[in-house]
Interface confidence: low
């Protein structure tokens, strides 16, 4: 703690200007009122002060509001952010978008900090669920960010939202993450054409049924194969050639290159050799002519 | 400071293989997708391979597909590109990027020649 | 495979100058696009991603426009340093594609 001493005759800060950035450590703590500080955080951004003196300003700050500082002075700290502890932010109560935006700046191209990920969690558990506007701001900060969250949490993202979402946000979602927001998906672009419906929609298919996948199949949509290679392989493994071959369209010659990983080498298992053959790709692996093929799930279900 | 460095670019004959790596400092490597995109003499950029960031996902351009494996080391924060059967339209300075579509950051690139 | 092609494929102009360098997609990429700055013998910088949203660090002087097929990189005020190749490329599905570039010279 920075010890209490009298400010120097003439010291007395009246407002927040550079003049101040020649203040000793004990000077600041001494001649800058906490109040003023507060009214005119805004200029603080523009200051070059050092980390020690933000220290001083953040510790004024800290003794003029010990239950946490109100949105006014948060929207305005700027650098002085970085400053501040996951403890420090969970006295906050951030409620405007605006806010959020300005300390998302701050920390914008670094990983996402202890800070940051507090600071989202106090601002979305304050909104009580992810609407559009704050996924399009916390998702064009951090692309990572949807998945970063438990099904759970996604859970509470109205389909309204989903417009907000872009392919690379979803690039590190696993499977059950995609399964609680491709129905989502499925509702907020249910009134698009069928073209139009496939490009909104691609992003999310690893959350896709089997039913949903056939009836894509019939819609011309040549599905690549980056797509299909993403989808859940419990819904794959019951496609037959004729669905999948219509579902990749073009795309189906890259099924070769990928005969050896899921969910395509395990799809070609379950398809009859003959059926393969007709693809003319050379795809080997398939259940050999004469055999019976077994629903192994409904086995199980008696057994 | 995010850094890429590209090494293993050499003169190589047509039909043999050479294997290049990509050495990055400076972020957490095994968070992010990386890729290696081409630019030949004269030519513009080409996008040649893909991979996820635990290394369980692969995309190659149709022209290396076959030829060319790309992997990572994420204990050691290095990419690579292996390229076997090279042939003289693979000679390129090659690059590796970081970023899922959009590739934020470079490396300056390590030249590949192919010639007999 | 998505065919990018860009417009003009090299161009000149002054100091101060507005330019605009068009980017056009064979199909439907929505707003998959981003665009990168190539200096000789320097690597791609990335300048615009989602077509429009200008990444940290570049002035604001580059802006981008456009989705669906037709695309646009404009730089309201030319400065010295912007004469470069412009590249752009989608990222809507895979393979990733770029443009041919657009070299951008001094009158």
């Known amino acids: 703690e920075v010890e209490k001493t009298a400010c120097p005759s003439g010291k007395k800060a009246r407002e927040i200007d550079e003049s101040l950035i020649f203040y000793k450590k004990w000077e600041l703590e001494a001649c800058v009122d906490a109040a003023l500080l507060a009214t005119q955080m805004d200029r603080v951004n523009a200051i070059p002060f050092t980390y020690e003196q933000l220290d001083v300003l953040k510790h004024k700050l800290d003794e003029l509001y010990p239950q946490g500082y109100p949105e006014s002075v948060i929207q305005h700290l700027g650098y002085l952010f970085l400053k501040m502890s996951p403890e420090d932010i969970r006295k906050w109560n951030v409620t405007s978008l605006e806010t959020l935006k300005a300390l998302l700046e701050v920390n914008k191209g670094h990983e996402m900090s202890p800070q940051v990920a507090t600071l989202i969690d106090r601002f979305v558990k304050g909104r009580g669920q992810l609407d559009k506007d704050t996924l399009d701001t916390l998702t064009a900060f951090y692309p990572g960010y949807l998945c970063s969250l438990s099904p759970e949490e996604l859970s509470s993202v109205p389909p309204s939202s989903i417009w907000a979402v872009r392919p690379q946000d979803l690039d590190t979602c696993d499977p059950r993450q995609l399964d609680v927001l491709y129905p989502k998906a499925r509702l907020a672009f249910q009134n698009m054409n069928g073209s139009e419906y496939f490009v909104k929609i691609q992003s999310f298919l690893g959350g896709a049924p089997t039913e949903d996948l056939k009836a894509l199949s019939q819609q011309n949509v040549s599905m690549d194969l980056a797509t299909f290679m993403k989808l859940r392989t419990d819904a794959v493994l019951p496609l037959t050639v004729a669905e999948v071959q219509k579902l990749l369209g073009p795309h189906v010659e890259g099924l070769k290159a990928e005969e050896r990983h899921r969910p395509v080498r395990d799809w070609i298992l379950r398809q009859r050799q003959d059926d393969l053959d007709t693809l003319g790709l050379g795809l080997q692996g398939g259940i050999p002519n004469g055999y019976l093929v077994l629903d192994l799930s409904m086995q199980e279900a008696l057994s | 400071e995010v850094q890429l460095v590209e090494s293993g670019g050499g003169l190589v004959q047509p039909g043999e293989s050479l294997r290049l790596s990509c050495a990055a400092t400076?972020?957490?490597?095994?968070?992010?997708?990386m890729h290696w995109v081409r630019q030949g003499p004269g030519k513009g950029l080409v996008w040649v391979s893909r991979?996820?960031?635990?290394?369980?996902?692969?995309v190659y351009a149709d022209s290396v597909k076959g030829r060319f494996t790309i992997s990572r080391d994420n204990a050691k924060n290095t990419l690579f590109l292996q390229m076997n059967s090279l042939r003289a339209e693979d000679t390129a300075v090659y690059y590796c990027?970081?970023?899922?579509?959009?590739?934020?950051?470079w490396g300056q690139g390590t030249l590949v020649t192919v010639s007999s | 495979d998505i065919q990018m092609t860009q417009s003009p494929s090299s161009l000149s102009a002054s100091v101060g100058d507005r330019v605009t360098i068009t980017c056009r997609a064979s199909q439907d990429i929505g707003s998959w696009l981003t665009w990168y700055q190539r200096k000789p013998e320097k690597a791609p910088k990335s300048l615009i991603y989602a077509a429009s949203s200008l990444q940290s660090g570049v002035p604001s002087r580059f802006s981008g426009s456009g989705s669906g097929t037709d695309f646009t990189l404009t730089i309201s005020s030319l400065q010295p340093e912007d004469f470069a190749t412009y590249y752009c490329?989608?990222?809507?599905?895979?393979?990733?594609?770029f443009g041919q570039g657009a070299k951008l010279e001094i009158k």
């Open positions: 490329q989608q990222y809507k599905s895979y393979p990733l594609t």
């Open positions: 990027a970081r970023g899922r579509g959009i590739m934020t950051y």
């Open positions: 991979i996820n960031s635990d290394g369980t996902s692969t």
């Open positions: 400076g972020f957490t490597f095994s968070s992010y997708w």
